[in-house]
């Protein structure tokens, strides 16, 4: 990019740059038209008979150089040949010479400073490609000569630039002063501003653009080179902040529209709302769940709401005395979420129809809460007592909703209580045939013991088919057609109107090894 | 001799037309910036038209109170120059003179901004 | 546009310096020129370029321009130089010529 200080081709009244010395033959302004009819101004020196030693000058005004280092002078002047001029001594030259003077403020006078090298800094003579050539009566013919010339270090607030002729014939058509600075650039997001260069590189410190954030890593910095171009190096620029996406080529970070959300900084585009969200503004980084849905806090932020699920459907009971297992259906609605859990509450009353919250001589298996299974055994319940049971469905996100958690009830009556276990069985005789037993007989809370069941098999003997009952309402039983020498496990229980109590302890006896040694007593 | 010298004025009715020339010699008139300049009778100068040297189709300037009405031409090939004056008015009354621009030492495109040769006039009378 | 302003007349006695002013806005910025008229003749340019002077025209003319005002000094005054004088410059369109209303210089 090139900052113009001065175009004569723009200015639009006289130059009216100083000349030095004072006589005839020096430099003169003229007018003229532009290719576009545009009023323009040169400057024209003719004195090839000059005096020997006798040099012409001209010195633009002054120019600030607003923090340029380098300034570039571009000339376009057209030369006259020598041997064109008739009247043209060995005087005639075809080249001029520019110098420069700076100074912090405009100080130059008509003689001050000093017309010669030192103070005025030469930048260099300056030869003409192509030498105009003019016959007399005739137009002159001849191509422009355009020359750039760099001048600087330049340090003061300002320069003159200044053109020394010796002898030449020649028309300095237009003289464009400007310096290189590289162009403001956004690139990856990053703004590099606009930059002078002050070296021959310089390290120039990009910013974010509006709503972005830095990338991690060192701050961006591209180099600007003297001649105004930026060094090509990788950018690790920034990235569009949480609810803006990168648009108009990484340049700009723009807000995402209505109904779309970008939730982290960095590239990637804003996505549409995710089920059961909205965002109502732009620039979301988030939407906003729907009424009755939620994000759990260990969600993502782009994640889709949901809601909590429905009470789970068709409990199924079976009650086998003081246990019940309860099963049930999946709710038919999830909520939308894979986490789902089951808990169970309990409330019992008693016989007189007191109720209350069941108490803790209930165990559940495998709890009452946090089941991903769907079912649970119940344990330890009270026998004559009813039982209901809420199951509820839960999920990532119940915690968060309000109003009454949906359940599906079931309710259990347990029988009344049943004897309790036989134990204590003895033998009171045994034969290489026969056993026989006796037991005392159980306190059963619920009315009388109606009757017993025995069940034995053969030690060793543990299929099905080897497992023998006997039933008998006395508190005792003889159990015949046994095995010589063999032994036996046994366990009775008792049966009230409550139904059978639960098998006691196995109770281990042996049959006699022959008939000689008659019945004997045995005590269990 | 360098030298402008002028003809054409005269006596023309208001509205009339009248067509001035300037005779050139002595210098290369095809490289001059040519104008006119007239002076009402009493008053001071006054610029009316310019054109550059380059032909064909060489830029002209009119003051404000006679474009439109005035035109300036040139014929190189006979060093003249023209000024043809239509819808004249009282108030163009005045001794028009023919002017040179300062020239350029060999390019024609551009001239400086003094009238460096006059012409010795020729009086042009608009009255009924 | 620009304009020029001089004043009407000037008086001078032979011999002495005769100062003839052209004002105008920032005219320091523009070139002026100088134009002698003596009656019944065709204007003489006496000074181009604010202060050049061209071929044949006496030393004793010389002329400055800055600030607001331009000045066209006679040094030495003759007779021969009465006449009415008249200032010109570029107007802001550049291809525009303009003329002060004139300055009739009477040599007493």
């Known amino acids: 990019l090139e900052e113009t200080l001065l175009n004569t081709k723009l200015e639009t009244a006289d130059l009216k740059w100083v000349t030095f010395p004072q006589v005839d033959g020096q430099w003169e302004e003229l007018s003229g038209l532009d290719e576009e009819q545009h009023s323009v101004r040169t400057y024209e020196v003719c004195d090839v008979q000059r005096a020997p030693g006798q040099a012409h000058w001209l010195r633009t005004g002054w120019v600030p150089r607003r923090g340029a280092v380098h300034v570039y002078a571009t000339l376009r002047f057209t030369m006259l040949e020598c041997l064109s001029l008739p009247r043209a001594g060995r005087s005639c030259k075809e080249t001029f010479t520019v110098f420069y003077y700076e100074s912090d403020a405009d100080t130059a006078t008509a003689l001050t400073p000093a017309w010669m090298e030192n103070p005025y800094i030469k930048v260099d003579t300056v030869a003409a490609e192509h030498l105009t050539r003019k016959r007399p009566g005739a137009e002159a013919t001849g191509k422009v000569n355009v020359k750039t010339l760099r001048l600087g270090p330049l340090s003061k607030a300002g320069f003159y630039l200044a053109f020394q002729d010796q002898g030449a014939c020649m028309a300095l058509l237009s003289l464009h002063l400007f310096y290189k600075k590289c162009a403001q650039l956004t690139v990856n997001l990053t703004r590099f501003p606009e930059t002078v260069p002050r070296e021959l590189v310089v390290p120039v410190a990009g910013s974010c653009v509006v709503d972005a954030v830095p990338a991690p890593g060192p701050s961006p910095s591209l180099y600007c080179r003297e001649d105004g171009q930026w060094a090509e190096q990788p950018v690790t620029g920034c990235s569009c902040a949480p609810g803006f996406e990168a648009a108009e080529g990484n340049t700009k970070c723009r807000a995402c529209a209505q109904g779309t959300f970008k939730p982290l900084s960095g590239e990637g585009s804003c996505q549409p709302c995710p089920a059961n969200s909205h965002s109502n503004t732009i620039g979301s980084a988030v939407c906003q769940c729907r009424v009755g849905y939620f994000r759990a806090r260990t969600d993502p932020r782009g994640a889709p709401c949901t809601t909590p699920p429905s009470a789970p459907r068709s409990v199924v009971s079976r009650l086998n005395g003081s246990s019940l297992h309860l099963e049930w259906s999946a709710p038919l609605e999830s909520g939308g979420r894979e986490d789902l859990t089951y808990a169970l509450r309990c409330r019992e009353c008693r016989p007189g129809g007191s109720c209350a919250p069941c108490g803790g001589d209930l165990t559940f298996d495998p709890g009452p809460r946090d089941l991903v299974e769907p079912w649970v055994v119940v344990r330890g319940l009270r026998p004559d007592f009813t039982y209901t049971f809420e199951v509820t469905a839960l999920n990532g996100v119940s915690s968060l909703a309000t109003g009454p958690v949906p359940f599906e009830p079931v309710n259990v009556t347990t029988d009344r209580e049943v004897p309790p276990a036989v134990s204590d069985i003895r033998v009171t005789r045994s034969s290489p045939s026969s056993l026989s037993l006796a037991w005392a007989v159980p306190r059963a809370p619920s009315g009388a013991v109606l009757d017993y069941e025995v069940k034995y098999h053969e030690k060793g003997a543990e299929g099905p088919s080897s497992v023998r009952f006997l039933k008998t309402s006395e508190n005792r039983a003889e159990l015949r057609g046994l095995k010589r020498g063999a032994s036996y496990l046994v366990q009775v229980r008792a049966r009230s109107e409550a139904g059978y109590g639960p098998f006691g302890q196995e109770h281990h006896s042996q049959t006699q090894l022959d008939e000689s040694e008659g019945w004997r007593e045995q005590l269990a | 001799q360098v030298q402008l010298v002028e003809s054409g004025g005269g006596l023309v009715q208001p509205g009339g037309s009248l067509r001035l020339s300037c005779a050139a010699s002595g210098f290369t008139f095809n490289n001059a910036w040519m104008s006119w300049v007239r002076q009402a009778p009493g008053k001071g100068l006054e610029w009316v038209s310019t054109?550059?040297?380059?032909?064909?189709?060489?830029?002209?300037f009119y003051a404000a109170p006679v474009k439109g009405r005035f035109t300036i031409s040139r014929d190189n090939s006979k060093n003249t120059l023209y000024l043809q004056m239509n819808s004249l008015r009282a108030e163009d009354t005045a001794v028009y003179y023919c002017a040179r621009k300062g020239m350029s030492f060999y390019n024609n495109k551009y001239a400086k901004s003094m009238f460096d040769l006059w012409g010795q006039g020729t009086l042009v009378t608009v009255s009924s | 546009d620009i304009e020029l302003t001089q004043p009407p007349s000037v008086s001078v006695a032979p011999g002495q310096t005769a100062r003839i002013s052209c004002s105008g806005d920032?005219?320091?910025?523009?070139?002026v020129h100088w134009y002698q008229q003596k009656p019944g003749q065709a204007p003489v340019l006496v000074i181009y370029?604010?202060?050049k002077r061209p071929s044949g025209i006496p030393e004793r003319f010389s002329g400055s321009n800055s600030g607001n005002t331009a000045t066209l000094t006679i040094s030495g005054t003759q007779a021969e130089d009465e006449a009415d004088y008249y200032c010109s410059a570029w107007t802001t369109t550049m291809m525009h010529i303009v003329f002060g209303g004139g300055t009739k210089l009477t040599v007493l």
């Open positions: 920032n005219l320091g910025k523009k070139y």
């Open positions: 054109i550059e040297a380059k032909m064909p189709n060489g830029a002209t």
């Open positions: 370029y604010d202060s």
